[in-house]
Interface confidence: low
Protein backbone atom coordinates (compact mmCIF):
# COMPACT_ATOMS: atom_id res chain seq x y z
CA UNK A 1 0.00 0.00 0.00
CA UNK A 2 0.89 3.83 -0.52
CA UNK A 3 3.07 5.61 2.23
CA UNK A 4 1.52 6.47 5.90
CA UNK A 5 3.04 8.95 7.95
CA UNK A 6 3.63 6.64 11.11
CA UNK A 7 4.42 7.96 14.42
CA UNK A 8 5.32 4.97 16.07
CA UNK A 9 4.56 3.57 19.46
CA UNK A 10 3.69 5.94 21.90
CA UNK A 11 4.94 4.78 24.85
CA UNK A 12 4.26 8.63 26.35
CA UNK A 13 0.70 7.44 26.68
CA UNK A 14 1.19 3.69 28.52
CA UNK A 15 -2.62 3.46 29.05
CA UNK A 16 -4.00 1.02 32.41
CA UNK A 17 -7.52 0.12 32.87
CA UNK A 18 -8.71 -2.26 35.05
CA UNK A 19 -10.28 -5.49 33.86
CA UNK A 20 -14.15 -6.04 33.89
CA UNK A 21 -14.52 -2.05 33.79
CA UNK A 22 -15.69 -0.33 30.70
CA UNK A 23 -13.01 1.87 28.67
CA UNK A 24 -12.90 4.91 26.67
CA UNK A 25 -9.40 5.49 24.81
CA UNK A 26 -9.32 8.39 22.34
CA UNK A 27 -7.28 7.86 19.24
CA UNK A 28 -4.14 10.11 20.47
CA UNK A 29 -3.36 11.57 16.78
CA UNK A 30 -6.48 13.85 17.32
CA UNK A 31 -4.86 14.77 20.90
CA UNK A 32 -1.26 14.86 20.33
CA UNK A 33 0.11 14.65 17.04
CA UNK A 34 -2.62 16.49 14.16
CA UNK A 35 -3.11 20.34 14.24
CA UNK A 36 -7.18 19.48 13.29
CA UNK A 37 -9.27 17.49 15.06
CA UNK A 38 -11.65 14.44 14.48
CA UNK A 39 -14.86 16.65 13.54
CA UNK A 40 -13.00 18.27 10.55
CA UNK A 41 -10.99 14.89 9.71
CA UNK A 42 -14.37 13.59 9.10
CA UNK A 43 -15.79 16.35 7.50
CA UNK A 44 -12.75 16.36 4.55
CA UNK A 45 -13.72 12.51 3.99
CA UNK A 46 -10.70 11.05 5.86
CA UNK A 47 -11.37 7.67 7.35
CA UNK A 48 -10.76 6.30 11.21
CA UNK A 49 -9.59 2.64 11.11
CA UNK A 50 -8.57 0.76 14.22
CA UNK A 51 -6.35 -2.40 14.55
CA UNK A 52 -4.55 -3.94 17.08
CA UNK A 53 -0.86 -6.41 18.13
CA UNK A 54 -1.97 -8.88 20.70
CA UNK A 55 0.54 -9.05 23.69
CA UNK A 56 3.24 -11.22 22.96
CA UNK A 57 2.67 -11.47 19.07
CA UNK A 58 3.67 -9.72 16.34
CA UNK A 59 0.51 -9.67 13.79
CA UNK A 60 -1.24 -6.67 13.59
CA UNK A 61 -5.16 -7.69 13.12
CA UNK A 62 -8.35 -6.27 12.70
CA UNK A 63 -10.33 -5.37 15.79
CA UNK A 64 -13.65 -7.22 16.18
CA UNK A 65 -16.64 -5.01 16.15
CA UNK A 66 -19.15 -7.94 16.19
CA UNK A 67 -18.72 -9.49 19.59
CA UNK A 68 -21.35 -10.13 21.96
CA UNK A 69 -23.24 -7.06 23.64
CA UNK A 70 -21.05 -4.59 21.22
CA UNK A 71 -18.09 -4.96 23.98
CA UNK A 72 -15.81 -3.30 21.95
CA UNK A 73 -17.23 -0.56 19.73
CA UNK A 74 -16.15 2.94 18.14
CA UNK A 75 -17.43 6.38 18.31
CA UNK A 76 -16.20 9.20 16.54
CA UNK A 77 -12.60 8.97 17.48
CA UNK A 78 -12.91 6.81 20.53
CA UNK A 79 -12.41 2.81 21.52
CA UNK A 80 -15.21 1.88 24.12
CA UNK A 81 -14.79 -1.65 25.59
CA UNK A 82 -17.71 -2.68 27.84
CA UNK A 83 -16.41 -3.80 29.48
CA UNK A 84 -12.62 -4.79 29.23
CA UNK A 85 -11.17 -8.64 29.38
CA UNK A 86 -7.39 -9.52 30.38
CA UNK A 87 -6.55 -10.76 27.40
CA UNK A 88 -7.96 -7.10 25.53
CA UNK A 89 -3.93 -5.73 26.88
CA UNK A 90 -1.91 -5.38 23.52
CA UNK A 91 -0.43 -1.86 21.32
CA UNK A 92 -3.43 -0.88 19.50
CA UNK A 93 -3.01 1.22 16.24
CA UNK A 94 -5.47 4.14 14.98
CA UNK A 95 -4.76 5.29 11.45
CA UNK A 96 -6.81 7.90 9.38
CA UNK A 97 -6.44 7.46 5.89
CA UNK A 98 -8.42 8.13 2.64
CA UNK A 99 -6.75 7.64 -0.92
CA UNK A 100 -4.61 10.40 -0.78
CA UNK A 101 -3.22 10.86 3.06
CA UNK A 102 -2.75 8.45 5.74
CA UNK A 103 -1.27 8.89 9.39
CA UNK A 104 -1.24 6.52 12.41
CA UNK A 105 0.23 6.20 15.86
CA UNK A 106 -0.10 3.32 18.10
CA UNK A 107 -0.02 2.70 21.60
CA UNK A 108 0.02 0.01 24.52
CA UNK A 109 -3.26 -0.54 26.45
CA UNK A 110 -2.56 -2.92 29.96
CA UNK A 111 -5.76 -4.09 31.60
CA UNK A 112 -4.75 -4.67 35.22
CA UNK A 113 -6.61 -6.97 37.43
CA UNK A 114 -6.74 -5.26 41.56
CA UNK A 115 -7.56 -7.10 44.61
CA UNK A 116 -10.82 -6.53 46.65
CA UNK A 117 -8.65 -3.77 48.82
CA UNK A 118 -7.98 -2.43 45.24
CA UNK A 119 -4.44 -2.87 45.07
CA UNK A 120 -2.93 -3.61 41.39
CA UNK A 121 0.30 -2.44 39.69
CA UNK A 122 -1.73 0.21 37.89
CA UNK A 123 0.93 3.34 38.06
CA UNK A 124 -1.29 6.03 40.44
CA UNK A 125 -1.76 9.95 40.22
CA UNK A 126 -0.39 11.69 43.31
CA UNK A 127 -2.43 14.53 44.73
CA UNK A 128 -0.83 16.86 46.67
CA UNK A 129 -2.68 18.72 49.87
CA UNK A 130 -1.42 21.34 51.72
CA UNK A 131 -1.24 20.45 55.72
CA UNK A 132 -4.05 22.64 58.20
CA UNK A 133 -4.74 24.95 55.54
CA UNK A 134 -8.69 24.90 55.35
CA UNK A 135 -10.97 22.37 53.46
CA UNK A 136 -9.28 21.10 50.53
CA UNK A 137 -11.12 18.40 47.78
CA UNK A 138 -10.16 15.52 45.45
CA UNK A 139 -12.55 14.89 42.53
CA UNK A 140 -12.66 11.34 41.60
CA UNK A 141 -10.52 11.22 38.17
CA UNK A 142 -11.32 10.23 34.42
CA UNK A 143 -14.82 9.62 34.79
CA UNK A 144 -16.55 12.44 32.11
CA UNK A 145 -17.80 10.85 28.94
CA UNK A 146 -19.28 7.07 30.34
CA UNK A 147 -22.64 8.65 31.27
CA UNK A 148 -24.78 11.07 29.81
CA UNK A 149 -25.68 13.63 32.59
CA UNK A 150 -28.82 12.49 32.93
CA UNK A 151 -27.41 9.61 34.60
CA UNK A 152 -26.84 9.66 37.90
CA UNK A 153 -24.04 7.13 39.27
CA UNK A 154 -23.44 6.53 42.95
CA UNK A 155 -19.76 7.14 44.14
CA UNK A 156 -18.45 5.21 46.94
CA UNK A 157 -15.32 6.77 48.65
CA UNK A 158 -12.52 3.88 50.23
CA UNK A 159 -9.18 4.79 52.02
CA UNK A 160 -6.97 2.00 51.75
CA UNK A 161 -9.74 -0.64 52.13
CA UNK A 162 -11.90 0.94 54.22
CA UNK A 163 -15.32 2.78 53.10
CA UNK A 164 -15.39 6.63 54.33
CA UNK A 165 -17.68 7.32 56.64
CA UNK A 166 -17.78 8.54 59.91
CA UNK A 167 -13.92 10.07 59.38
CA UNK A 168 -13.71 12.85 61.60
CA UNK A 169 -11.52 15.34 58.71
CA UNK A 170 -12.76 13.55 55.20
CA UNK A 171 -16.50 13.35 53.83
CA UNK A 172 -17.33 12.25 51.10
CA UNK A 173 -19.09 14.78 48.60
CA UNK A 174 -20.52 12.99 45.98
CA UNK A 175 -17.73 12.97 42.78
CA UNK A 176 -15.67 14.98 45.49
CA UNK A 177 -13.74 14.16 48.67
CA UNK A 178 -13.39 16.77 51.22
CA UNK A 179 -10.42 16.92 53.50
CA UNK A 180 -11.59 19.61 56.57
CA UNK A 181 -8.04 19.75 57.35
CA UNK A 182 -5.32 17.29 55.60
CA UNK A 183 -3.12 16.28 58.18
CA UNK A 184 -0.46 13.54 57.56
CA UNK A 185 -2.74 11.11 59.22
CA UNK A 186 -4.65 11.35 55.86
CA UNK A 187 -1.66 10.23 53.47
CA UNK A 188 -2.79 7.18 51.52
CA UNK A 189 -4.15 5.79 48.87
CA UNK A 190 -7.62 7.17 47.94
CA UNK A 191 -10.30 4.84 45.63
CA UNK A 192 -13.70 6.16 44.48
CA UNK A 193 -15.71 3.18 42.87
CA UNK A 194 -18.37 4.67 40.49
CA UNK A 195 -21.64 2.77 40.01
CA UNK A 196 -24.02 3.88 36.98
CA UNK A 197 -26.61 1.40 34.79
CA UNK A 198 -25.94 1.11 30.90
CA UNK A 199 -28.96 -0.64 28.89
CA UNK A 200 -30.01 -2.46 31.54
CA UNK A 201 -26.27 -3.46 32.80
CA UNK A 202 -24.26 -1.99 35.66
CA UNK A 203 -20.94 -0.52 35.51
CA UNK A 204 -18.14 0.14 37.64
CA UNK A 205 -15.43 2.34 37.11
CA UNK A 206 -12.79 2.31 40.09
CA UNK A 207 -10.01 5.32 40.06
CA UNK A 208 -7.09 5.82 42.92
CA UNK A 209 -4.77 8.16 43.56
CA UNK A 210 -2.34 8.81 46.06
CA UNK A 211 -2.85 11.64 48.57
CA UNK A 212 0.53 13.27 49.85
CA UNK A 213 0.43 16.21 52.62
CA UNK A 214 2.74 18.87 51.96
CA UNK A 215 4.02 22.08 53.54
CA UNK A 216 1.45 24.95 53.52
CA UNK A 217 2.26 28.10 50.97
CA UNK A 218 1.39 29.66 54.51
CA UNK A 219 4.49 28.43 55.94
CA UNK A 220 6.96 29.01 52.90
CA UNK A 221 9.93 30.71 53.61
CA UNK A 222 12.81 31.65 51.49
CA UNK A 223 16.05 29.32 51.80
CA UNK A 224 17.79 29.13 54.75
CA UNK A 225 21.22 28.46 54.43
CA UNK A 226 22.50 26.21 57.52
CA UNK A 227 25.89 26.02 56.19
CA UNK A 228 28.04 27.97 55.80
CA UNK A 229 27.66 29.95 59.12
CA UNK A 230 29.76 32.86 60.75
CA UNK A 231 30.31 29.96 63.59
CA UNK A 232 32.73 27.91 61.65
CA UNK A 233 36.06 28.62 60.11
CA UNK A 234 37.73 26.65 57.79
CA UNK A 235 41.49 27.12 58.51
CA UNK A 236 43.93 24.44 56.64
CA UNK A 237 47.38 24.70 55.70
CA UNK A 238 48.00 24.42 52.18
CA UNK A 239 48.46 20.78 50.75
CA UNK A 240 44.94 19.37 53.56
CA UNK A 241 42.13 18.82 51.87
CA UNK A 242 38.88 21.49 51.91
CA UNK A 243 35.79 20.18 52.55
CA UNK A 244 33.29 23.02 52.86
CA UNK A 245 29.27 21.48 53.02
CA UNK A 246 26.67 24.15 51.75
CA UNK A 247 23.50 23.48 53.60
CA UNK A 248 20.21 24.70 52.52
CA UNK A 249 16.75 24.28 53.72
CA UNK A 250 13.63 24.60 51.51
CA UNK A 251 10.03 24.92 52.42
CA UNK A 252 7.87 22.61 50.13
CA UNK A 253 6.66 24.66 47.45
CA UNK A 254 4.40 23.28 44.31
CA UNK A 255 5.86 23.14 41.58
CA UNK A 256 9.38 25.20 43.04
CA UNK A 257 12.43 24.74 40.98
CA UNK A 258 14.85 24.32 44.37
CA UNK A 259 18.44 25.07 43.59
CA UNK A 260 21.91 25.09 45.24
CA UNK A 261 25.04 26.08 43.83
CA UNK A 262 28.73 27.21 44.49
CA UNK A 263 30.64 30.08 43.40
CA UNK A 264 34.11 30.35 44.09
CA UNK A 265 35.63 34.01 43.27
CA UNK A 266 31.96 34.97 42.02
CA UNK A 267 32.75 32.41 39.12
CA UNK A 268 30.62 29.02 39.42
CA UNK A 269 33.45 26.60 39.82
CA UNK A 270 33.30 25.00 36.16
CA UNK A 271 34.61 28.16 35.18
CA UNK A 272 37.98 28.42 36.82
CA UNK A 273 40.96 26.60 36.85
CA UNK A 274 41.18 24.82 40.46
CA UNK A 275 40.46 21.11 40.65
CA UNK A 276 37.11 21.56 42.60
CA UNK A 277 34.36 18.95 42.88
CA UNK A 278 30.78 19.25 44.25
CA UNK A 279 28.56 16.19 45.54
CA UNK A 280 25.20 16.75 46.33
CA UNK A 281 22.98 14.95 48.74
CA UNK A 282 18.86 15.42 48.85
CA UNK A 283 16.33 14.60 51.73
CA UNK A 284 13.07 15.04 52.41
CA UNK A 285 10.91 15.60 55.34
CA UNK A 286 7.17 14.10 55.72
CA UNK A 287 5.71 16.82 54.51
CA UNK A 288 8.07 17.41 51.07
CA UNK A 289 10.26 20.06 52.92
CA UNK A 290 13.53 19.42 51.61
CA UNK A 291 16.82 19.70 52.53
CA UNK A 292 19.95 19.83 49.92
CA UNK A 293 23.67 19.36 51.31
CA UNK A 294 26.18 20.30 48.43
CA UNK A 295 29.79 19.74 49.81
CA UNK A 296 32.41 21.64 47.91
CA UNK A 297 35.66 19.58 48.03
CA UNK A 298 39.81 20.58 47.22
CA UNK A 299 41.48 17.64 47.30
CA UNK A 300 45.30 19.56 47.87
CA UNK A 301 44.35 22.78 48.61
CA UNK A 302 47.10 26.26 47.99
CA UNK A 303 47.71 29.57 49.42
CA UNK A 304 46.38 31.02 46.84
CA UNK A 305 42.99 28.83 47.09
CA UNK A 306 42.73 29.67 50.41
CA UNK A 307 42.72 33.38 49.86
CA UNK A 308 39.56 32.66 47.55
CA UNK A 309 35.80 34.01 48.31
CA UNK A 310 33.63 30.63 48.76
CA UNK A 311 29.88 31.34 48.23
CA UNK A 312 26.67 29.18 48.66
CA UNK A 313 23.88 30.40 46.85
CA UNK A 314 20.23 28.96 47.30
CA UNK A 315 17.28 29.48 45.14
CA UNK A 316 13.75 28.57 45.06
CA UNK A 317 10.33 30.16 44.28
CA UNK A 318 10.38 32.51 47.64
CA UNK A 319 13.55 34.26 46.87
CA UNK A 320 17.39 33.56 46.63
CA UNK A 321 19.75 33.48 49.39
CA UNK A 322 23.73 33.63 49.40
CA UNK A 323 26.70 33.10 52.62
CA UNK A 324 30.32 33.37 52.38
CA UNK A 325 32.27 31.00 54.02
CA UNK A 326 35.09 32.01 56.36
CA UNK A 327 38.35 30.52 54.70
CA UNK A 328 41.47 31.25 56.20
CA UNK A 329 45.26 29.82 56.01
CA UNK A 330 46.43 28.18 59.44
CA UNK A 331 49.16 29.70 61.25
CA UNK A 332 51.62 26.84 61.38
CA UNK A 333 52.09 26.13 65.29
CA UNK A 334 55.87 27.42 66.37
CA UNK A 335 58.18 24.41 66.85
CA UNK A 336 59.23 24.50 70.34
CA UNK A 337 62.67 23.25 70.66
CA UNK A 338 64.02 26.54 68.09
CA UNK A 339 61.47 29.26 68.53
CA UNK A 340 60.46 28.60 71.96
CA UNK A 341 63.70 27.47 73.30
CA UNK A 342 64.90 30.76 71.45
CA UNK A 343 62.44 32.72 73.31
CA UNK A 344 63.70 31.48 76.69
CA UNK A 345 66.87 32.60 76.02
CA UNK A 346 68.25 29.14 75.58
CA UNK A 347 71.17 29.11 73.57
CA UNK B 1 6.06 53.68 54.94
CA UNK B 2 8.75 51.62 52.63
CA UNK B 3 11.03 53.32 50.75
CA UNK B 4 14.50 54.25 49.32
CA UNK B 5 15.90 57.62 49.35
CA UNK B 6 18.74 58.11 46.87
CA UNK B 7 21.13 60.94 47.07
CA UNK B 8 25.02 62.07 46.29
CA UNK B 9 24.26 62.14 42.04
CA UNK B 10 25.62 65.37 40.30
CA UNK B 11 28.05 66.58 37.61
CA UNK B 12 31.94 65.36 37.74
CA UNK B 13 34.71 65.38 35.64
CA UNK B 14 35.91 62.16 33.54
CA UNK B 15 38.09 60.39 35.83
CA UNK B 16 37.04 61.71 38.58
CA UNK B 17 35.04 59.82 41.67
CA UNK B 18 31.13 60.09 43.10
CA UNK B 19 29.40 58.36 46.14
CA UNK B 20 25.79 57.37 45.47
CA UNK B 21 23.38 56.69 48.86
CA UNK B 22 20.32 54.97 48.89
CA UNK B 23 18.44 55.18 52.46
CA UNK B 24 16.08 52.79 53.58
CA UNK B 25 13.15 53.63 55.79
CA UNK B 26 10.48 51.46 57.08
CA UNK B 27 12.29 48.22 56.82
CA UNK B 28 16.03 47.27 57.80
CA UNK B 29 18.58 46.73 54.85
CA UNK B 30 20.23 44.24 57.20
CA UNK B 31 17.48 41.56 56.43
CA UNK B 32 18.16 39.15 53.93
CA UNK B 33 17.33 40.66 50.72
CA UNK B 34 19.28 41.43 47.68
CA UNK B 35 20.23 45.26 47.52
CA UNK B 36 21.03 46.03 43.72
CA UNK B 37 21.96 49.20 41.76
CA UNK B 38 20.46 49.42 38.27
CA UNK B 39 21.64 52.40 35.76
CA UNK B 40 19.68 53.83 32.70
CA UNK B 41 21.32 56.44 30.35
CA UNK B 42 19.46 59.46 28.91
CA UNK B 43 16.86 57.67 26.24
CA UNK B 44 18.30 54.54 26.53
CA UNK B 45 16.85 51.10 28.18
CA UNK B 46 17.51 49.76 31.87
CA UNK B 47 21.01 48.16 32.67
CA UNK B 48 22.20 46.54 35.34
CA UNK B 49 25.14 47.56 37.86
CA UNK B 50 25.98 45.73 40.91
CA UNK B 51 24.38 43.62 43.92
CA UNK B 52 25.34 43.20 47.23
CA UNK B 53 23.12 40.27 49.14
CA UNK B 54 22.46 41.51 52.54
CA UNK B 55 22.17 38.87 54.54
CA UNK B 56 25.88 38.41 54.65
CA UNK B 57 27.69 41.58 53.72
CA UNK B 58 30.64 39.95 51.82
CA UNK B 59 28.41 38.26 48.83
CA UNK B 60 28.66 41.40 46.18
CA UNK B 61 28.83 40.89 42.12
CA UNK B 62 29.55 43.27 39.54
CA UNK B 63 28.35 43.55 35.79
CA UNK B 64 31.62 42.45 33.61
CA UNK B 65 31.82 46.15 32.48
CA UNK B 66 31.99 47.78 36.21
CA UNK B 67 35.73 46.39 35.36
CA UNK B 68 36.72 47.41 39.42
CA UNK B 69 35.67 50.96 38.97
CA UNK B 70 32.71 50.56 41.24
CA UNK B 71 32.30 49.24 44.78
CA UNK B 72 28.80 48.58 46.54
CA UNK B 73 28.79 48.43 50.30
CA UNK B 74 26.54 49.13 53.03
CA UNK B 75 26.28 50.78 56.61
CA UNK B 76 23.76 48.87 58.54
CA UNK B 77 23.91 51.30 60.93
CA UNK B 78 22.84 53.92 59.04
CA UNK B 79 20.25 51.56 57.09
CA UNK B 80 22.06 52.52 53.81
CA UNK B 81 23.29 51.08 50.48
CA UNK B 82 26.67 53.14 48.57
CA UNK B 83 27.97 53.12 45.22
CA UNK B 84 31.49 54.23 45.49
CA UNK B 85 31.98 55.17 41.86
CA UNK B 86 35.80 56.00 40.44
CA UNK B 87 37.85 56.92 37.10
CA UNK B 88 34.25 57.97 36.02
CA UNK B 89 33.94 58.30 31.72
CA UNK B 90 31.45 59.95 29.61
CA UNK B 91 29.09 56.35 29.25
CA UNK B 92 28.82 56.33 32.78
CA UNK B 93 26.47 59.38 32.33
CA UNK B 94 23.08 57.80 33.28
CA UNK B 95 20.05 57.68 35.93
CA UNK B 96 21.41 55.72 38.58
CA UNK B 97 18.57 53.55 40.96
CA UNK B 98 19.00 51.59 44.10
CA UNK B 99 16.49 48.23 44.00
CA UNK B 100 15.72 45.91 46.41
CA UNK B 101 14.17 42.06 46.18
CA UNK B 102 14.12 39.17 47.47
CA UNK B 103 15.66 37.31 44.51
CA UNK B 104 18.35 38.60 42.86
CA UNK B 105 16.38 40.93 40.09
CA UNK B 106 13.15 40.83 41.74
CA UNK B 107 13.29 43.97 42.57
CA UNK B 108 10.10 45.16 44.09
CA UNK B 109 11.24 48.06 45.97
CA UNK B 110 12.88 50.93 43.65
CA UNK B 111 14.18 54.59 44.72
CA UNK B 112 13.87 57.54 42.89
CA UNK B 113 16.74 57.77 40.56
CA UNK B 114 19.57 60.24 40.62
CA UNK B 115 21.62 61.48 37.78
CA UNK B 116 24.88 61.01 37.58
CA UNK B 117 27.03 63.58 34.96
CA UNK B 118 30.09 62.74 33.46
CA UNK B 119 31.86 65.96 31.24
CA UNK B 120 34.57 68.43 31.19
CA UNK C 1 26.94 36.22 29.33
CA UNK C 2 23.18 35.97 29.03
CA UNK C 3 21.50 38.28 26.00
CA UNK C 4 17.70 39.14 26.35
CA UNK C 5 16.01 39.80 23.02
CA UNK C 6 12.94 41.58 23.49
CA UNK C 7 10.27 41.90 20.30
CA UNK C 8 8.59 44.55 19.70
CA UNK C 9 10.52 47.56 20.25
CA UNK C 10 7.73 49.49 20.10
CA UNK C 11 4.34 48.76 19.37
CA UNK C 12 1.11 51.22 19.24
CA UNK C 13 -2.65 49.97 20.17
CA UNK C 14 -5.42 51.35 21.61
CA UNK C 15 -7.50 51.11 25.06
CA UNK C 16 -9.09 47.77 24.91
CA UNK C 17 -6.32 45.77 22.92
CA UNK C 18 -4.85 42.37 23.90
CA UNK C 19 -1.17 43.49 23.84
CA UNK C 20 2.15 40.33 23.86
CA UNK C 21 5.39 41.67 24.24
CA UNK C 22 8.02 38.75 23.62
CA UNK C 23 11.35 38.40 25.29
CA UNK C 24 13.93 35.38 23.92
CA UNK C 25 16.87 34.56 26.60
CA UNK C 26 20.16 33.23 24.56
CA UNK C 27 20.38 30.11 27.29
CA UNK C 28 18.59 28.35 29.39
CA UNK C 29 17.26 30.33 32.27
CA UNK C 30 14.07 28.48 33.91
CA UNK C 31 11.54 30.65 34.84
CA UNK C 32 13.90 33.20 36.13
CA UNK C 33 12.57 36.44 34.44
CA UNK C 34 10.94 39.44 35.52
CA UNK C 35 8.76 42.19 33.70
CA UNK C 36 9.33 45.65 34.43
CA UNK C 37 7.09 48.91 33.66
CA UNK C 38 8.50 52.29 33.60
CA UNK C 39 6.88 55.46 32.81
CA UNK C 40 8.69 58.52 31.72
CA UNK C 41 10.69 60.24 34.98
CA UNK C 42 9.82 57.44 36.91
CA UNK C 43 11.55 54.38 38.62
CA UNK C 44 10.61 50.79 36.78
CA UNK C 45 7.61 49.15 38.91
CA UNK C 46 7.95 45.25 39.23
CA UNK C 47 4.72 43.53 37.11
CA UNK C 48 6.02 39.85 37.59
CA UNK C 49 8.38 36.98 38.24
CA UNK C 50 9.26 34.06 38.56
CA UNK C 51 8.08 34.25 34.57
CA UNK C 52 4.20 33.89 35.66
CA UNK C 53 3.97 35.44 39.51
CA UNK C 54 1.78 38.60 39.58
CA UNK C 55 3.67 41.02 41.92
CA UNK C 56 1.70 42.12 44.85
CA UNK C 57 -0.76 44.88 43.65
CA UNK C 58 -0.83 44.71 39.79
CA UNK C 59 -3.86 44.37 38.04
CA UNK C 60 -5.10 40.91 36.95
CA UNK C 61 -5.15 41.83 33.13
CA UNK C 62 -0.87 41.67 33.27
CA UNK C 63 0.16 37.80 32.85
CA UNK C 64 3.10 36.59 31.99
CA UNK C 65 4.20 33.06 30.53
CA UNK C 66 6.89 30.66 29.20
CA UNK C 67 9.62 29.29 30.31
CA UNK C 68 13.69 27.92 29.07
CA UNK C 69 14.45 30.75 26.33
CA UNK C 70 11.01 31.94 25.42
CA UNK C 71 9.17 34.21 27.35
CA UNK C 72 5.73 37.00 27.05
CA UNK C 73 3.58 39.56 29.15
CA UNK C 74 0.51 39.73 28.30
CA UNK C 75 -2.03 42.39 28.80
CA UNK C 76 -5.46 41.47 27.84
CA UNK C 77 -7.25 44.47 27.97
CA UNK C 78 -4.84 48.13 27.28
CA UNK C 79 -6.05 50.95 30.33
CA UNK C 80 -5.07 53.91 29.68
CA UNK C 81 -2.44 54.11 32.18
CA UNK C 82 -0.67 51.13 30.80
CA UNK C 83 1.10 53.13 28.00
CA UNK C 84 4.13 52.95 28.81
CA UNK C 85 7.81 50.91 28.49
CA UNK C 86 8.01 46.87 29.79
CA UNK C 87 11.64 45.52 30.38
CA UNK C 88 11.90 41.87 30.76
CA UNK C 89 14.86 40.99 33.35
CA UNK C 90 16.60 37.69 32.51
CA UNK C 91 17.50 36.54 35.71
CA UNK C 92 20.45 34.16 35.24
CA UNK C 93 20.58 32.24 38.46
CA UNK C 94 24.36 31.87 38.27
CA UNK C 95 24.74 35.49 38.11
CA UNK C 96 27.59 36.00 36.05
CA UNK C 97 25.30 37.91 33.94
CA UNK C 98 25.84 41.16 32.64
CA UNK C 99 23.06 42.91 30.85
CA UNK C 100 20.05 40.70 31.73
CA UNK C 101 17.40 43.30 30.95
CA UNK C 102 16.06 43.26 27.42
CA UNK C 103 16.07 46.46 25.11
CA UNK C 104 12.75 47.95 25.99
CA UNK C 105 8.94 47.80 24.47
CA UNK C 106 7.56 51.11 24.16
CA UNK C 107 3.73 50.55 24.16
CA UNK C 108 2.55 54.42 22.99
CA UNK C 109 -1.48 55.34 21.68
CA UNK C 110 -2.25 54.34 18.04
Known amino acids: SERCDDWGLDTMRQIQVFEDEPARIKCPLFEHFLKFNYSTAHSAGLTLIWYWTRQDRDLEEPINFRLPENRISKEKDVLWFRPTLLNDTGNYTCMLRNTTYCSKVAFPLEVVQKDSCFNSPMKLPVHKLYIEYGIQRITCPNVDGYFPSSVKPTITWYMGCYKIQNFNNVIPEGMNLSFLIALISNNGNYTCVVTYPENGRTFHLTRTLTVKVVGSPKNAVPPVIHSPNDHVVYEKEPGEELLIPCTVYFSFLMDSRNEVWWTIDGKKPDDITIDVTINESISHSRTEDETRTQILSIKKVTSEDLKRSYVCHARSAKGEVAKAAKVKQKVPAPRYTVELACGFGAT | EVQLEQSGGGLVQPGGSLRLSCAAS?????????RCWVRQAPGKGLEWVSC?????????YYANWVNGRFTISRDNSKNTLYLQMNSLRAEDTAVYYC???????????WGQGTLVTVSS | DIVMTQSPSSLSASVGDRVTITCQAS??????LAWFQQKPGQAPKLLIY???TLASGVPSRFSGSGSGTEFTLTISSLQPEDFATYYC????????????FGGGTKVVIK
Open chain 2, 99 to 109: ASGVGFGYFNL
Open chain 2, 26 to 34: GFSLSTSYW
Open chain 2, 52 to 60: IYAGSGDVT
Open chain 3, 27 to 32: EDIYSN
Open chain 3, 50 to 52: DAS
Open chain 3, 89 to 100: LGVYTHISADNA
